[in-house]
């Protein structure tokens, strides 16, 4: 029997039942290779509470349709007196990526999963040349899912200070150049997930091979390698490779675009601080609303409830389905059953079944999917209790006053599936919006203006037009809602601009769209504020103008008009200046745009060196000066000593030329002991200094990701911006 979904065959997939602390391993084409589950297990269940393993699906006992895969076992299970076999059921839906299997529910006998994946699509429109699994579970069974970052067309431009080259990447899959309007990517070879553009030429520097890996808590790594044999002539004999490290931001660092942290010998190291690297809580509720602090999620489906005897009706060929959410169906022939979903046979309306009961309800927000599950319906002939799964989709323009209507999509073993497009399922994800703008290779980053939490305070705009008695206070945050503190305490929760006067507070707009570059300035538009009459809502425009060296000045109110429906602010700030690379001398560097100066000379050791010890080597490093440690060469800025035989390598000659770009200070030592390759490439060292105000001097850390380049990172308070 041919594999039903060949794209999914190369990997063993994972799904989790968080409530019961159970990890499932799934291999849909072969076996999972877990001894405790036996040689032919396709679905292996690991109960972490009891530390036991059970096979809940056998690869030999597989049956498949276009949208359903069932794995039976020979193990008996007892459900309400009927004798069944344990089985797993995976319902497939068309998705835009390979996706992830999602645990839905489990009964005594059946383990239900749902999987939105390109493999289940009738057409190949979303299928990739190369794609790898893009999620992982950590030790606490929390899911880290990068699927939302996958681009279906185009690519991400990696932030790099080199004006002559551009590195484009996709996440977990190759770059689709055909559907991308940007001409730069057209030349990228098929299959590449990392494409280096130099002039009019494009080179494949990495293709996806292995799935996403969790290397540390909240640090995910994706590695791309070049499959082709031929070497690239600018790589000094090395094979190109790309390592992307996704980092969950701490409170101090918000999401960013991918940043190149090292690129010696075509070994490209990229760091991407993104909320998608954080674990995504599975939010569940037994009511019709749920909220999750971490994801900034708030969902309330109660407006969808029907009352006064009416229900939603969904046509299912042989059957009609009467549904209500957040309440029972109140139609005559269903109400004795306490049904939320009621199934009525068209040809014989006396045949009525509850396809899920109101009091057996679970609302789940998981990885961007909003699902309402009703359990415990009437039994099918097999003894299983009917169940309904409603998948909600956000649709801001849904009919029926935004409520929309449920649509029956199919039935799998007495489980009934519906989709429901409604505006009440719209959830704004923070990470969807960037707090910056791009104009070709020019980058603008407004994140320095964001106020996150106390003790920080909102920006207050200057308004010279009013007398003290009629004074309005205008509180503004950038790419974030205003902090509810001080005079802004009463501001509406999701307002990004808020006006406060003696009559109360007003929402002047929410952060709904990313900043844009317009006419040399950055424009930030906040919309969907409070009502201002005639069915209109208040809108605010902020024009940010580059003012080098100034991150302190406040925004100024320029105009307010259209009967209080429109406000315009102007803000002269260094955050609106283009990011540029600057070089310095004598262990100092000055960022003229932002007005920051950095001096790392306190890190220079007059005698000795900083030591980094690994199992095989000792590394000695100095900052802006030579290491004075035997057996290192006297002029080396960094040196490597083998523990086994004290063999020594110079990792680069010392210098004091710091470079600064977008919050990263770097020191490059070149011209070390040559490698033993055809080109005899000299060894080099790159030290990246990162700001941490508590670190003091700090110490160097070796990044063990790549053996052919020597990359160190160094947290230090001396890398934190100081006003000159």
């Amino acid at each position: 029997q041919a594999a039903p979904f060949p794209e999914l065959c190369s990997y063993t997939w994972e799904a989790v039942d968080t409530k019961n602390n159970v990890l499932y391993k799934i291999n849909i084409c072969g076996s999972v290779d877990i001894v405790q589950c036996g040689p032919s297990s396709a679905v292996c269940m690991h109960d972490l509470k009891t530390r036991t393993y059970h096979s809940v699906g056998d690869s030999v006992l597989r049956s498949a349709t276009r949208s359903l895969l069932e794995f039976n076992t020979t193990v008996s299970c007892d459900q309400q007196g009927t004798n069944h076999r344990v089985q797993s059921s995976i319902a497939f839906l068309c998705g835009k990526t390979l996706g992830t299997p999602e645990f839905v529910t489990a009964t005594e006998c059946v383990h239900y999963f749902e999987w939105r994946t390109t493999a289940a699509c009738k057409k190949d429109i979303f299928k990739a040349n190369k794609e790898v699994p893009c999620y992982v579970f950590d030790e606490e069974l929390r899911k880290h899912d990068l699927n939302p970052l996958i681009k279906l067309s185009g690519a991400y431009l990696v932030d790099d200070s080199d004006p002559d080259t551009s590195l484009f990447i996709n996440v977990c899959r190759d770059i689709d150049t055909l559907r991308d309007p940007g001409s730069q990517l057209r030349a990228c070879p098929p299959g590449t997930a990392a494409c280096l553009v130099r002039g009019h030429q494009a080179f494949d520097v990495g293709q996806p091979r292995d799935g996403l890996k969790l290397v540390r808590k909240d640090r995910l790594v994706l590695s791309y390698v070049r499959e082709e044999a031929g070497k690239l002539d600018f790589c000094d004999g090395h094979s190109p490779a790309v390592t992307i490290t996704f980092v969950c931001p701490s409170e101090r660092r918000e999401g960013t675009i991918p940043k190149l942290t090292a690129k010696s010998n075509c070994r490209y190291e990229i760091e991407w601080i993104t909320e998608y690297a954080c674990h995504r809580d599975y939010l569940e509720s037994k009511t019709c609303s749920l909220s999750g602090e971490q994801q900034d999620v708030s969902i309330d489906l109660t407006p969808l409830a029907q009352s006064g005897g009416s229900s939603y009706i969904s046509d299912g060929k042989e059957y009609l389905f009467y549904l209500n959410v957040c309440g029972e169906t109140e139609i005559q022939f269903c109400n004795k059953k306490q049904a939320a979903v009621c199934q009525v046979k068209k040809s014989d309306t006396s045949q009525v079944k509850a396809a899920g009961r109101y009091h057996n309800q679970t609302l789940r927000y998981s990885d961007g999917d909003l699902t309402l599950i009703y359990f415990g319906g009437d039994e099918c002939s097999s003894g299983f209790q009917r169940m309904s799964v409603i998948n909600f989709e956000c649709n801001k323009t849904a009919g029926n006053d935004g409520k929309g209507t449920p649509v029956f999509t199919g039935e799998v073993d007495c489980t009934y599936f519906f989709t429901w497009d409604t505006e009440y399922a719209c959830v704004k994800e923070k990470e969807d919006l960037l707090c910056g703008a791009t104009d070709g290779k020019k980058r603008y980053d407004l994140s320095a203006l964001v106020r996150h939490a106390e003790p920080e305070q909102n920006w207050e705009a200057v308004d010279g037009s009013q007398t003290e008695t009629e004074k309005k206070h205008f509180f503004i945050n950038i790419c974030h809602r205003v902090l509810q503190e001080g005079k802004a305490r009463g501001c509406p929760e999701d307002a990004a601009v808020c006006a406060v006067d003696k009559n109360g507070s007003k929402n002047l707009g929410k952060f709904i769209s990313s900043p844009m570059k317009e006419k040399g300035n950055i424009q930030l538009s906040y919309s969907d504020g409070d009502d201002c009459g005639h069915g209109k809502k208040i809108k605010t425009n902020i024009t940010l103008v580059c003012k080098p060296g100034d991150l302190e000045s406040a925004p100024v109110l320029r105009t307010s008009g259209e009967g209080g429906c429109f406000y315009e602010f102007e803000w002269h700030t260094a955050a609106a200046c283009v990011l540029s690379k600057t070089e310095g001398e004598n262990c100092t560097v000055f960022d003229s745009q932002a007005g920051f100066s950095f001096d790392l000379s306190p890190l220079t050791k007059k005698n000795g060196a900083y030591k980094v010890e690994t199992k095989k080597y000792d590394f000695y490093i100095n900052v802006c000066g030579p290491v004075s440690v035997s057996p290192c060469q006297p002029d080396s800025g960094a040196c490597q000593v083998a523990k086994s035989d004290e063999k020594t390598w110079n990792l680069g000659l010392s210098n004091a030329k710091l470079s600064y770009y977008d919050g990263m200070i770097q020191l490059n030592y070149r011209g070390g002991t040559p490698y033993n390759n055809e080109r005899h490439t000299p060894r080099a060292t790159l030290i990246t200094f990162l700001c941490d105000r508590d670190a003091g001097v700090g110490f160097p850390e070796y990044q063990e990701e790549d053996n052919s380049t020597y990359n160190f990172r160094w947290y230090t308070s001396y890398a934190c911006p100081e006003e000159p």
């Epitope: 540390r216 909240d218 701490s250 980094v612 010890e613 690994t614 700090g698 070796y702």
Partner: nanobody, 123 residues
Framework: EVQLVESGGGLVPAGGSLRLSCAAS????????MGWFRQAPGKERKFVAT????????YYADSVKGRFTISRDNAKNTVYLLMNSLKPEDTAVYYC????????????????WGQGTQVTVSS
């Protein structure tokens, strides 16, 4: 897999001393650099000290330099933190952590963590 168990915390007057211990299970203890971190209520986890796998390299946070000493005994699979001249601002839960191969300042780079031991310094 490495499991870490801290002990030695408690209540101590300002100026007093404590010695924290962190016992590791597993035969590969000497493959790991070890670190001590602390977390006060409502605050982020902060670096305190780190020691390389052999014990040959140690680094400390500025706030504890000269007062705290980190050491390890690979034969006993244990790492220690000797805390002298304790101050009320040293009050926190102290965590022991293990990182494969080499040391780091960043708590997110550590592979294994203990459950923590409470240290309270009264004024």
């Amino acid at each position: 897999e490495v499991q870490l168990v801290e002990s030695g915390g408690g209540l101590v007057p300002a100026g007093g001393s404590l010695r924290l211990s962190c016992a590791a299970s597993g035969r590969t203890f000497s493959n790991y650099a070890m670190g001590w971190f602390r977390q006060a209520p409502g605050k982020e986890r902060k670096f305190v000290a780190t020691i390389s796998w052999s014990g040959g390299v140690t680094y400390y946070a500025d706030s504890v330099k000269g007062r705290f000493t980190i050491s390890r005994d690979n034969a006993k699979n244990t790492v220690y933190l000797l805390m002298n001249s304790l101050k009320p601002e040293d009050t926190a839960v102290y965590y022991c952590a293990a990182k494969r191969d080499s040391s780091s300042y960043d708590h997110r780079r550590y592979d294994y963590w203990g459950q923590g031991t409470q240290v309270t310094v009264s004024s």
